[in-house]
């Protein structure tokens, strides 16, 4: 499932890019899942994707910000774990998560992505995959 891993890693890079422009984002509070319970990662991931992160339309960074936000919302390649989790009805709703400003929102999104990469690697035989 290298494509899945690449996609997750790319999302982290896009989040890091957006963190450079945090002062150019609308300072709105957004649902930001943290300490997500096991098997609710994909549900939390979709909460991050649904959040209305927006450019403040100031300065000349508007285009790169909008493109980055759009790329964050792209559907990643699905995995067996993701397909299984989509059927769970017990995960918290997006609205139930604490709302945070863009800086913390992006940091929490990155943490979730890192957790998902770690889980993905842990579910595979150690050392058997090509980087």
């Amino acid at each position: 499932q290298d494509r899945h891993m690449i996609r997750m890693r790319q999302l982290i890079d896009i989040v890091d890019q957006l963190k450079n422009y945090v002062n150019d984002l609308v300072p709105e509070f957004l649902p930001a899942p943290e300490d997500v319970e096991t098997n609710c990662e994909w549900s939390a991931f979709s909460c991050f994707q649904k959040a209305q992160l927006k450019s403040a339309n100031t300065g000349n960074n508007e285009r790169i910000i909008n493109v980055s936000i759009k790329k964050l919302k792209r559907k990643p390649p699905s995995t067996n774990a993701g397909r299984r989790q989509k059927h769970r009805l017990t995960c918290p709703s997006c609205d139930s998560y604490e709302k945070k400003p863009p800086k913390e929102f992006l940091e929490r999104f990155k943490s979730l992505l890192q957790k998902m990469i770690h889980q993905h690697l842990s579910s595979r035989t150690h050392g058997s995959e090509d980087s």
Epitope: I6, R9, D16, E129, D130, S131
Partner: antibody, heavy 117, light 106 residues
Framework: QVQLVQSGAEVKKPGASVKVSCKAS????????MHWVRQAPGQGLEWMGL????????IYNQKFKGRVTMTRDTSTSTVYMELSSLRSEDTAVYYC??????????WGQGTLVTVSS | DIQMTQSPSSLSASVGDRVTITCRAS??????LNWYQQKPGKAPKLLIY???RLHSGVPSRFSGSGSGTDFTLTISSLQPEDFATYYC????????FGGGTKVEIK
Amino acid sequence: QVQLVQSGAEVKKPGASVKVSCKASGYTFTDYWMHWVRQAPGQGLEWMGLIDTSDSYTIYNQKFKGRVTMTRDTSTSTVYMELSSLRSEDTAVYYCARYGPLAMDYWGQGTLVTVSS
Amino acid sequence: DIQMTQSPSSLSASVGDRVTITCRASQDISNYLNWYQQKPGKAPKLLIYYTSRLHSGVPSRFSGSGSGTDFTLTISSLQPEDFATYYCQQFNTLRTFGGGTKVEIK
């Protein structure tokens, strides 16, 4: 097999620009992003940035922002790195490297760019 | 920016020796660390990714360990083809390389 073949050595004057190419083969070009890394003579490696080969989205090292431009041509499976306002400190070997799942898994052979008056 | 510091910058060793190279990050990078080998006039080659995972085709005498800020690359029994420069690289936040460690023949 995966291959990244770069353009030949260049000699440039200070203030000029250079455009280095990197032709990919052996895999689906738009499935993998590409990094650019440089190495000054006798020095370590320095990450310059990356490009999404499917849509030209770029992320640059802040150090090079405003001077570096990364582009791609899907018809020839080639990525380009252009560096402008060259100075002597830009003398280096420039590498393209494929964005693997968690690492730069394949590298080009490198292109030496010499900046000298 | 995350800084990566490698030590030593160079070392002399003999064939069969056990060699250890360390890499320290200026902040916590979890397991987001890779190791590359570079020989003179050649491009770097990936050895180890995600701290301890061997890239395909890399001999098992190479191993990596660590977490957080301190990492180690170990060559259990140095072979003639292992004399080269080794670089660590973080990918927790974008990418940064260490300064390199040159492994020379004693």
